[in-house]
């Protein structure tokens, strides 16, 4: 029987129970948080040979080995990974090994074994006969193998029963406990798996079968598992499903599901029956189960119980991640918030549509609303009192709505209101006005002249940059001298420059009122000398690297008809010169002839600027004599060379520690102090561990029911 | 874990109709996909019919579709078999089910069941 998709059992150890009849779990098998002590040689499940997703093991107490539970279980195959992993075994902290004695497949992903402190037995397993690469295991903190003493079935009355491999160097036996081996198949079978008789299963079988070259006795497909056979690819006329099996159209159609996304089924795409159309995907029509190419962004409407959605903080936007179409009111009320205009960004910036109307009041913290970045209708079929559509109300720092020259936004119904917004000049309110097809339509308060833009330089001159002169992480500009009717109100400038691959950037990327900037910002003073242009050496950049670069000027509050004068330049973009390129990353050489080397590499990971050859050199070198000196036909004592690994195991050192000159006859030497690439190492090992940790209790931890 | 009990079982002449009722508790009733099944006496555990957890897909056996009718109230945590031209075959033990996130057509080993509410159909 076929159970899923994905089984969790929590608290209660007689919940196992419903593995009873299951032969596949399809999706994962989560056992976990059991903090009572049970006796668990009761439950036994050998029909289950297959979970398709991962299996995980987090604080069962009183569960010593895996093998009675699960005597059969043959392939986990990985489909999907929790943290990149298909097996995790954590603070289990009764368990003494693994014994899953027939595991011999894990087709995707890496294991993961920590905190177990009474787990031996994990040195005698070769993970590498099941799975492909071994490099991502992590395997820590578990019972220090000299405290395991972990010896395979035979070995004290050395009639050794189980086959050995070679592991870091060391040619030992596999074992999965005192009393079972781990299964090795033939030299003979090559990849494919075999019986339990050594014989060959079919290439289509994955980690066993019933009876040889047969592609309807395995335990486990490589592929897909079709009406009782293993095949490579799905028939006609069926799907791909859950990464194992065929499915046909009807069984897709009638697939229920309890998530949000239900109301219009399962969809066929790409050979697959699937949740939903993947992304860049839309379904062709609203009862279709097949999918179209989007146009453009995927449309996702979003919609508000309540009607009016309040976006008040980085958490609340969340929720409209992806949203392209929002049915409902926007009311936007950011007082305060770290790097809060790239993370709207990241969440607001694919809505295209608010069916309402959208009110920004008590915002300080924003400065421009270009995170909107793809708003382009307002259709006010819901109106504030008074019939506004798009309100602005009481934002300190809002300079700027949107680069006009590049966005049009239409508002198709209701008026716009302005009040109290300081530094928002009435001419950026005036070019809304046009752009969004409302002029005409306000009244005269609704767009207050007095208090918008009384603290804003709004009657903008233009500062024109008059030379520029770049090296390789260098740029050095200089400007005309700006001017204002009086000298005396010129306080300093203000040059803003950053990386700008792309000639798109505008002055408000990135920037908030609470001191995120994607900009970098440096002050320049006024020249002593009036007739010298002012400038700036610009240091420490990077080579081949565009570069948008601006200035302002720094004016006290001189006013004019009731409003600042300021003088701010365009934006210019500039690239600073070519240099060396960083060395060519992985040389290889190999040799392939007795006159012939072959040597690749990768491209450097800095190229500064563009690369158009490569020199290779090379050069002959002596042989080493020390490959003469032994005749290798004899069988005996073949020189082996030790070479010092440059660890030391901590628990050994007991005594103070020697303080002698290392080398020569002095004895034990003292542990080098860690490099900083080492203390480096340990640290990202900390945190990863953390992050692993928190990933862990976040996906596993539920909040009790109501 | 899932509490779900039965009631609404009993006596009804064939042609007859009859609602059964499921009430669940423990967990977020919406994020479960519910089931009916039946037993009769003496044969296997069989499927009688599934909705979606929004309420909006239904799923019905060949052998009543047109005569029952699955329903869900998420705000009263209640599954519903509306079961109409009741015929003597029907008579059966018939048990609520949930099962988390998703159901596929051939699963049987649903995560959580009820105790069962007997239906008799005689005259």
């Known amino acids: 029987e076929i159970c899923g998709p994905g089984i969790d059992i929590r608290n209660d150890y007689q919940q196992l129970k419903r593995l009873e009849n299951c032969t596949v779990i399809e999706g994962y098998l989560h056992i976990l948080l059991i903090s009572k002590a049970e006796d668990y040689r009761s439950y036994r499940f050998p029909k289950l040979t297959v979970i398709t997703e991962y299996l995980l093991l987090f604080r069962v107490a009183g569960l010593e080995s895996l093998g009675d539970l699960f005597p059969n279980l043959t392939v986990i195959r990985g489909w999907k990974l929790f943290y990149n992993y298909a097996l995790v075994i954590f603070e289990m902290t009764n368990l003494k090994d693994i014994g899953l004695y027939n595991l011999r497949n894990i087709t995707r992903g890496a294991i993961r074994i920590e905190k177990n402190a009474d787990l031996c037995y994990l040195s005698t397993v070769d993970w590498s006969l099941i799975l492909d690469a071994v490099s991502n295991n992590y395997i820590v903190g578990n019972k220090p193998p000299k405290e395991c003493g972990d010896l395979c079935p035979g070995t004290m009355e050395e009639k050794p029963m189980c086959e050995k491999t070679t592991i870091n160097n060391e040619y030992n036996y596999r074992c999965w406990t005192t009393n079972r081996c781990q299964k090795m198949c033939p030299s003979t079978c090559g990849k494919r798996a075999c019986t339990e008789n050594n014989e060959c299963c079919h290439p289509e079988c994955l980690g066993s079968c019933s009876a040889p070259d047969n592609d309807t006795a395995c335990v486990a497909c490589r592929h897909y598992y079709y009406a009782g056979v293993c095949v490579p690819a799905c028939p006609p006329n069926t799907y791909r499903f859950e990464g194992w099996r065929c499915v046909d159209r009807d069984f897709c159609a009638n697939i229920l599901s309890a998530e949000s996304s239900d109301s219009e089924g399962f969809v066929i795409h790409d050979g697959e029956c699937m949740q939903e159309c993947p992304s860049g995907f839309i379904r062709n029509g609203s009862q279709s189960m097949y999918c179209i190419p989007c146009e453009g962004p995927c449309p996702k409407v979003c919609e508000e119980e309540k009607k009016t959605k309040t976006i008040d903080s980085v958490t609340s936007a969340q929720m409209l991640q992806g949203c392209t179409i929002f049915k409902g009111n926007l009311l936007i009320n950011i007082r305060r918030g770290n790097n809060i205009a790239s993370e709207l960004e990241n969440f607001m910036g694919l809505i295209e549509v608010v069916t309402g109307y959208v009110k920004i009041r008590h915002s300080h913290a924003l400065v421009s609303l270009s995170f909107l970045k793809n708003l382009r209708l307002i259709l006010g079929e819901e109106q504030l009192e008074g019939n506004y559509s798009f309100y602005v109300l009481d934002n300190q720092n809002l300079q700027q709505l949107w680069d006009w020259d590049h966005r049009n936004l239409t508002i198709k119904a209701g008026k716009m209101y302005f009040a109290f917004n300081p530094k928002l000049c009435v001419s950026e309110i005036y070019r809304m006005e046009e752009v969004t097809g409302t002029k005409g339509r306000q009244s005269k308060g609704d767009i207050n002249t007095r208090n918008n833009g009384e603290r804003a330089s709004c009657e903008s001159d233009v500062l024109h940059f008059t030379s520029t002169t770049t090296s390789k992480n260098r740029i050095i500009i200089t400007w005309h001298r700006y001017r204002p009717p009086d000298y005396r109100d010129l306080i300093s400038f203000t040059v803003y420059y950053k990386e700008a691959p792309f000639k798109n950037v505008t002055e408000y990327d990135g920037q908030d009122a609470c001191g995120s900037n994607s900009w970098n910002m440096v002050d320049v003073d006024l020249p002593p000398n009036k007739d010298v242009e002012p400038g700036i050496l610009l240091h420490g950049l990077k080579p081949w690297t565009q570069y948008a670069v601006y200035v302002k000027a720094v004016t006290l509050t001189m006013v004019e008809n009731d409003h600042i004068r300021g003088a701010k330049s365009e934006i210019l973009y500039i690239r600073t010169n070519a240099s060396v390129p960083s060395i060519p990353l992985d040389v290889l050489s190999a040799s392939n002839s007795s006159s012939q080397l072959i040597v690749k590499w990768n491209p450097p990971s800095l190229p500064n600027g563009n690369l158009s050859y490569y020199i290779v050199r090379w050069q002959r070198q002596p042989q080493d004599g020390y490959l003469y000196r032994h005749n290798y036909c004899s069988k005996d004592k073949i020189p082996i060379r030790k070479y010092a690994d440059g660890t030391i195991d901590i628990e050994e050192v007991t005594e103070n520690p020697k303080t002698e000159v290392c080398g020569g006859e002095k004895g034990p030497c003292c542990a080098c102090p860690k490099t900083e690439a080492e203390k480096q190492a340990e640290k990202e090992e900390a945190e990863y561990r953390k992050v692993f940790e928190n990933f862990l209790h976040n996906s596993i931890f539920v909040p009790r029911p109501e | 874990e899932v509490q779900l009990v039965e009631s609404g079982g009993g006596l009804v002449q064939p042609g007859g109709s009859l609602r059964l009722s499921c009430a669940a508790s423990g967990r977020t009733f919406s994020s479960f996909v519910m089931s009916w099944f039946r037993q009769a006496p003496g044969k296997e555990r069989e499927f009688v019919s599934a909705?979606?957890?929004?309420?909006?897909?239904?799923r019905y056996a060949d052998s009543v579709k047109g005569r029952f009718t699955i329903s869900r109230d998420n705000s009263k945590n209640t599954l519903y078999l509306q079961m109409n031209s009741l015929r003597a075959e029907d008579t059966a033990v018939y048990y609520c089910?949930?099962?988390?996130?998703?159901?596929?057509?051939?699963?049987?080993?649903?995560?959580?069941w009820g105790q069962g509410t007997l239906v008799t159909v005689s005259s």
């Open positions: 909705i979606s957890g929004s309420g909006s897909r239904q």
């Open positions: 089910a949930a099962n988390p996130r998703r159901a596929t057509p051939d699963l049987s080993q649903y995560a959580y």
